[in-house]
């Protein structure tokens, strides 16, 4: 599996962000493809759970990430995306997104890098 | 296969109400987010309305932001809008779409008259 | 909200030719772009997602490229069942926003 992401991304505090990512594979996408989201803190903390797809989206039950985000990927088009809402300045840190999809399970990890600022600083602000 | 069927246009006077919905079958409805997007009588497609999996947040233009409401229920595969305050401005063909506009339903014609 | 630019509005072609449409966005959209067929009293469909990537059944003469505010969609040799209205859009930010539509005629 390949992984294509942003790689880095500026959003500003208390608005809502698309972490994107998007994966190509050599075998078709069918119920067997998974996503994991997970999350590095900038403090270098311990890595955290964000998301889960598998057929369903899985939303973490607890933890920072409890009610703010929600999948926003289409298999069909080979997007992993998720929603990350009401952006704090303690969500400052790596996403990675893996992408399995049996029998293509191998492949990079794509990363993100998110910078919540105060105010838009230029037009690398991605909305929605 | 996908299916998308919209049903609850009509007629409604200026500063009236009315309440669309949009069956979905052929795919795990819960798993996408939605949206509504209306085409006016002069062909010019317009987003109106988008709904994320999960919790349900929503998202609208600054044009009907306040008058319209979008909601699901995943147990019925069902999407919902609600229009009030309606305007002739709103006169248009409605239609429901899977997540950002993969597939699209044939649509509901609302028209806004006195 | 971003405005996308769409060129030309009308196209009168032959069966055989190859046509160009171009959508111009007022700020960038990376490659949030998506083109959009409408036939005679019918919905749109989706043919081109990600600027690049053709989606689920289309056929390879439509193609799209592009990035950051310069985009084009190619139908490299039309077909009289390719009459039909063609929609660029941006999902880069919230309005999504839509270009004025090319209606595309055969002689």
């Known amino acids: 599996v390949e992984i294509y992401t942003s790689r880095v991304l500026e959003a500003v505090n208390g608005t809502d962000a698309r972490l994107k990512c998007t994966f190509s594979s050599f075998a078709p996408v069918g119920d067997a493809l998974t996503v994991t989201w997970n999350f590095r803190p900038l403090d270098g903390g311990p890595e955290q759970f964000v998301f889960y797809y598998h057929i369903d989206p899985f939303q973490p039950m607890s933890g920072r990430f409890k009610d703010r985000v929600s999948w926003d990927g289409n298999p069909e088009r080979y997007d992993a995306s998720i929603l990350l809402w009401k952006l704090q300045f303690d969500d400052n840190g790596t996403y990675t997104c893996q992408v399995k999809n049996p029998p293509d399970v191998d492949g990079v990890i794509g990363e993100i890098r998110l910078s919540v600022v105060h105010t838009v600083r230029f037009s690398e602000i991605h909305f929605l | 296969e996908v299916k998308l069927v919209e049903s609850g246009g009509g007629l409604v006077q200026p500063g009236g109400s009315l309440k669309l919905s949009c069956a979905a079958s052929g795919f795990t409805f819960s798993s996408y987010t939605m949206s509504w997007v209306r085409q006016t009588p002069e062909k010019r497609l317009e987003w109106v309305a988008y709904i994320t999996t999960g919790a349900g947040r929503t998202y609208y233009p600054d044009t009907v932001k306040g008058r319209f409401t979008i909601s699901r229920d995943n147990a019925k595969n069902t999407l919902y809008l609600q229009m009030s305050s309606l305007k002739s401005e709103d006169t248009a063909m409605y239609y429901c779409a899977r997540h950002r506009g993969d597939y699209w339903g044939q649509g509901t014609s609302v028209t806004v008259s006195s | 909200s971003i405005v996308m630019t769409q060129t030309p509005k009308f196209l009168l072609v032959s069966a055989g030719d190859r046509v160009t449409i171009t959508c111009k966005a007022s700020?960038?959209?990376?490659?949030?772009v998506a083109w959009y067929q409408q036939k005679p009293g019918q919905s749109p469909k989706l043919l081109i997602y990600y600027a690049s990537n053709r989606f689920t059944g289309v056929p390879d003469r439509f193609t799209g490229s592009g990035y950051g505010t310069d985009f084009t969609f190619t139908i490299s040799t039309v077909q009289a069942e390719d009459l039909a209205v063609y929609f660029c859009?941006?999902?880069?930010?919230?309005?999504?926003?839509f270009g004025g539509g090319t209606k595309l005629e055969i002689k």
């Open positions: 859009q941006q999902d880069y930010s919230s309005p999504w926003t």
């Open positions: 700020q960038s959209v990376s490659n949030d």
